[in-house]
Each structure stands twice: as structure tokens, then as C-alpha cells.
Interface confidence: medium
């Protein structure tokens, strides 16, 4: 059994680990979300640049210092291009998010073009359609009852959008969506202990060919991809969506991770690899945005002054554009964008950020040398709630994102999408679909707390991502009734 003196021997301060669990007992037992545990660890040693912790029995370094973070995420990126999540490449394992550095380079080169401004503009009408359907649904429900659980409600919108934009699928009825959502929810919420196993015995999942994803999920994505490939006769359809790109790759047969195309770094595009990308786009496209929007709506319900300012901005911009929401008007709404950024400061969804050292590495500004294969962790939540960087951090305040304020802060003090080359490939897509929907909501409804709104909202411990425990309950009041 590995002993817990690894960091002591190296003179790195850190919290006392407990047998078997290291410093992750609460998250391993699903009492607290991993992101919350990391935030607590971050807060324990306010004067340290780095903290030595144990994920189960594996020593890892939690980095607090923003300059060090800049080195890891940007300046010395080639040392940290791996996320360090090792499990079977089968069963959805070779997806863009979890892939090792080489696989990621090969895939990333290909998928980045999906999210250019031009492509996003093309997708906008699909998002728009989804948002209109969503508002119609909310309006109809509102006639019966004004209270909503907005987290799961918004999942029906983001599920439609990602299905339409990435896969060309139309979920006509809420029922179809719910069925797909129930399956996809299982990945995010069913407690799988494979991650903990990987922390204790890095590489074991890969050696045993184990996946962290339930079979039902794998089968869902396999049949999804098979159906679309069949519909398009295995060839790109001209829609220029995510699936077309995948079909192009399928025709190529392999992608290379460097411009010289050395076979050592090429990745064969099998149906397994295609399924893995479909899976990660689905998850990344629907859950993160739905959760962010739900939290934003929650904060607007609790902060009516901010909501009033947003409604005024939305009304003004819509009035100037004949009531139409366009790709450009969404970008134009300065206060809306700031409120979105502030939501992500308070509720960064992917926690913690993780990288693996591909060689021994001296941590800048310290005497600490980490060994090859050491996992390095960053807690966006810890940083985002650190009063050193954000005054009164528990207060929702979009003005923190005035250009002037942002300019005063360290560039690594805000990390909702990660940083550097391996940041979130879909962040512009996520922002666009979220802000479009919020704009539509605020143009039609005022959000108020309901009698069941939890004013002390906790983070769901069972989900891999940050999310609201018990959902978010608010009232949506049609504005024609309150104006």
C-alpha cells in the first residue's frame, strides 16, 4: 500500500490524508461534490502556491498560485497537454474531452472549425427555433401553473439545440426529449466508482479495458450515430454540422495529430471513435448550458434589480431590431453577457481542472519538482470565491465584468472554460445558446422566487459536474400580467 508521506518528504504542505480515501473521503462517499471538496482544500492553505493532496492514494498537486496556473495552462502547455484520465479507449473513452494529448491533437485539429463564427451563425436559426418552441411550452405550462423546476426544464431546450445543431435530429415532442434525457442523465448522475479506482491505481481502467460510462449510454450513442450515418448514406450531407464533419473523417479513415502526418501519431476513425465524439458533444452541449442558465435564472429571481436592468436592455435591443433576436444582438447585449460571466464565476460547471505532467517539471517560483505522470489540479471555484480576487464573492454582481474591472484582474483569476489550447472548444456555442434562451425568457417573463425556492442552494454531490441539489424552483410570471 502506498504511504501518505510523498508530499511531506518533498516539503510540500497539505491537509492530513485519511487511510484509503486520501483527502477525498467526502466526494468518494458522495457526501460532497468533488468541486466543493477541491474548493475546501484550496481554502485550507491561503498562503501556499501549491498544496500536496491525495486523491484516494495517489499524490496530486493542487495549484493555487495564478502565475503557476498560467505556466501550466499556457506557457508550458506542451508538458501538460494530457488531462490524465486514463480508461479504456473503447466504450466512449477516446472522446475529445478525456483523450490523451496525442488523440486530442488529432481530434481537436478537426473539430475546431465547427465553432467558427460562420458556422455558429448558420446554427443560430436552429437554436432560435428551439428557443421559440421552448418559450411556447413554458407559456402553455404557465397558464396551468407558474412554478417551474428550471434546471430540468432547461435541459429540454439544450437537448433540442445540441440534437439539431450537432446531429440534425428533431425531437418533436417533449416526450422524445425526456426519453433521451433520462438515458443521458444516467451518465452524469449514476454513481460510478470507476473514477475513484483510477485515482487509486492510475492506468488500471485502461489495462482492464474498463469504461466509466454505463453500457446503456454507450448503446444509446451507438444507435444514434448508426441511424444518422444510415440517413446520410455514410456521406456528408452538406449541412456542415458536427455529424457531417464526423462523416468526412470517417471517409478519410484516420486523422493525424501533426502536420507531417507521421503514422505514429495518427488516429484511426472507427465507429467507436465517432460514438465517443457524439457522446462528448451531447454531454458538453446540453448539461453545462442548462445548468448555467438555471443558476442565472436563480440569481435573477433573487436579485430583482439586476433582472430589471437586464429586461430593460433586452427590451431596448429588441425594439431597435424589430423584435428579432439575432446572432449579433446577442453579442450586443453587454449587461446580459456580464451577467452570464458572473453566473459562471459563481457556478463554474466543470470542477476541478486537471492536467498530467508528461515529464518531470519544476513548479515556477518554488523548489517543488513534480515527477512525470503527476496529476495537477486547479480549483476554479476556489479562485472564483477568493476575496483576494473578488470582493464579496458570494454576491451576484455582473459589474465585476466591466472591461475596466476585468483588466485589473490576473488573466487566470477566471477559469470557467479552462485556459490555453485545451480550453473548452464549445464555449462560444454554449454562450450563444444560453444567451439566446435567456433573452427570449426575459422578453416574455419576469422571474420571481416561489414558495419552494431554496435560498441556500447546495451543490448536488452525486453529479460529476456542478449542479443544483434538488433542482431550482422559481415562478415565471408572464410580463403582460406584471407590466
Amino acid at each position: 500500500m502506498r504511504t501518505f508521506n510523498y508530499w511531506k518528504k518533498r516539503n510540500v504542505r497539505g491537509p492530513e490524508p485519511v487511510v484509503f480515501f486520501g483527502n477525498l473521503k467526502d466526494s468518494a462517499l458522495r457526501k460532497k461534490n468533488m468541486g466543493v471538496v477541491m474548493e475546501e482544500l484550496y481554502n485550507m492553505f491561503p498562503e501556499e502556491k501549491v498544496i500536496g493532496i491525495y486523491r484516494m492514494t495517489s499524490p496530486c498537486l493542487l495549484v493555487r498560485d495564478l502565475d503557476v496556473i498560467k505556466h501550466i495552462m499556457i506557457k508550458d502547455f506542451e508538458v501538460f497537454s494530457d488531462r490524465g484520465v486514463e480508461f479504456s479507449k473503447e466504450g466512449l473513452g477516446s472522446n475529445l474531452f478525456h483523450a490523451d494529448g496525442e488523440t486530442w491533437r488529432a481530434l481537436g485539429n478537426r473539430f475546431t472549425p465547427i465553432f467558427t463564427s460562420g458556422k455558429l451563425k448558420n446554427m443560430f436559426y436552429l437554436m432560435h427555433e428551439g428557443a421559440d418552441n421552448f418559450i411556447d411550452h413554458v407559456s402553455a405550462e404557465c397558464e396551468k401553473n407558474q412554478e417551474f423546476e428550471v434546471h430540468s426544464l432547461l435541459q429540454t431546450y439544450t437537448m433540442s439545440t445540441i440534437a439539431a445543431c450537432a446531429f440534425g435530429i428533431s425531437y418533436d415532442s417533449i416526450g422524445d426529449k425526456v426519453k433521451a434525457l433520462d438515458i443521458v442523465d444516467k451518465i452524469i448522475s449514476e454513481p460510478s466508482y470507476a473514477i475513484e479506482l483510477d485515482m487509486m491505481y492510475p492506468g488500471l481502467l485502461s489495462k482492464l479495458n474498463l469504461s466509466i460510462f454505463p453500457t446503456v449510454v454507450k448503446n444509446f450513442f451507438k444507435s444514434l450515430v448508426d441511424n444518422i450515418v444510415a440517413q446520410r448514406n455514410g456521406k456528408p450531407s452538406g449541412r456542415n454540422d458536427f455529424m457531417d464533419l464526423i462523416l468526412e473523417l470517417r471517409q478519410l479513415g484516420e486523422v493525424t495529430s501533426n502536420k507531417y502526418g507521421s503514422s505514429a501519431s495518427s488516429l484511426e476513425i472507427t465507429d467507436e471513435v465517432i460514438c465517443a465524439q457524439a457522446f462528448v458533444f451531447y454531454i458538453a452541449g446540453y448539461e453545462t448550458s442548462a445548468t448555467t442558465m438555471a443558476y442565472m435564472i436563480y440569481q435573477l429571481a433573487l436579485n430583482p434589480d439586476i433582472q430589471n436592468k437586464l429586461i430593460a436592455e433586452v427590451d431596448e435591443v429588441l425594439k431597435a431590431n424589430d423584435g428579432k433576436v439575432t446572432y449579433d444582438t446577442v453579442k450586443e447585449m453587454k449587461y446580459l453577457n456580464k451577467a452570464f460571466d458572473e453566473t459562471l464565476r459563481m457556478y463554474s460547471i466543470v470542477e476541478p481542472l486537471q492536467r498530467k505532467a508528461t515529464r518531470d517539471y519544476k513548479i515556477p517560483g518554488t523548489d517543488v519538482v513534480i515527477e512525470k505522470d503527476t496529476i495537477v489540479l486547479i480549483s476554479p471555484r476556489g479562485i472564483h470565491y477568493d476575496p483576494k480576487y473578488y470582493d464579496n464573492p458570494k454576491q451576484f454582481n455582473p459589474d465585476r465584468f466591466d472591461a475596466e474591472e476585468v483588466g485589473k484582474r490576473h488573466p487566470c483569476a477566471y477559469l470557467p472554460f479552462g485556459l490555453g489550447q485545451r480550453n473548452c472548444i464549445g464555449m462560444r456555442f454554449g454562450r450563444l445558446q444560453s444567451l439566446l434562451c435567456i433573452t427570449k425568457i426575459l422578453s416574455k417573463f419576469r422571474i420571481e422566487p416561489s414558495k419552494n425556492t431554496d435560498r441556500n442552494l447546495q451543490v448536488e454531490p452525486h453529479r460529476g459536474l456542478i449542479g443544483p441539489k434538488g433542482g431550482i424552483r422559481v415562478n415565471a410570471i408572464p410580463r403582460k400580467l406584471v407590466s
Partner: nanobody
Framework: QVQLQESGGGLVQTGGSLRLSCAAS????????MGWFRQAPGKERELVAD????????YYSDSVKGRFTISRDNAKNTVYLEIDSLKPGDTAVYYC????????????WGQGTQVTVSS
């Protein structure tokens, strides 16, 4: 249609505990989540807890946090409500209800089961 049948109510002493069950049948795929409500004499019906079938997302009202535990058995299409440290104020008819995703409009209801806490 979704049919709901509660059971497990009865007369209990203060400080005792109780486990209510709600069995769902019919088109249960229409149901995203199940809620337990209670209605005390002369008071309006209040939601006490809610659980989603698919992801197990749980909600408790502030008045019952810590004493009430909601759980589900998907294989049996059954939702449970465990009540500890019962107080006379918990005396009510307890109803289970089903709702769709996103809305908290519960569209299918059981008949209710009486819980009486004696001091």
C-alpha cells in the same frame, strides 16, 4: 394515465417513525418525478419532497429537511417517504403525485394515506 397508490399510513406515537410507499402503474414513462405532499386539517396542501426517476434528483421543503427521506425503487416503480422523529404537527393526509420534467404541476395524484401522530 398514471395510477398511484399510497400505503403505510397509520397512528404513531410522537418520536416514532413511519415509511410510506407509493406504487405507480400505467404509463409511468410519462412521469419524470414523484412528489409527496401533505394536507393537515384546515391547511392547504404542501409539497414536502420530490424525487426524479432518472437521475434521482431530490428536493425537500425546508420544513422537513433532516427528518424526511425520499427514495425510489425504479424496478418496482415505487417511491418511499421515510419520516423520523414524528411530531403532532406531522398529522395530515399524505399524497403522492407525479409530474413531467421541468414543471412542478403534478398532474396525477393518489388517493392519500392518513398519518396521525398522537402525543
Amino acid at each position: 394515465q398514471v395510477q398511484l397508490q399510497e400505503s403505510g399510513g397509520g397512528l404513531v406515537q410522537t418520536g416514532g417513525s413511519l415509511r410510506l410507499s407509493c406504487a405507480a402503474s400505467g404509463r409511468t414513462s410519462r412521469s419524470y418525478a414523484m412528489g409527496w405532499f401533505r394536507q393537515a386539517p384546515g391547511k392547504e396542501r404542501e409539497l414536502v419532497a420530490d424525487i426524479a426517476w432518472s437521475d434521482g434528483r431530490i428536493y425537500y421543503s425546508d420544513s422537513v429537511k433532516g427528518r424526511f427521506t425520499i427514495s425510489r425503487d425504479n424496478a418496482k416503480n415505487t417511491v418511499y417517504l421515510e419520516i423520523d422523529s414524528l411530531k403532532p404537527g406531522d398529522t395530515a393526509v399524505y399524497y403522492c403525485a407525479s409530474r413531467a420534467r421541468g414543471t412542478v404541476l403534478y398532474n396525477y395524484w393518489g388517493q392519500g394515506t392518513q398519518v396521525t401522530v398522537s402525543s
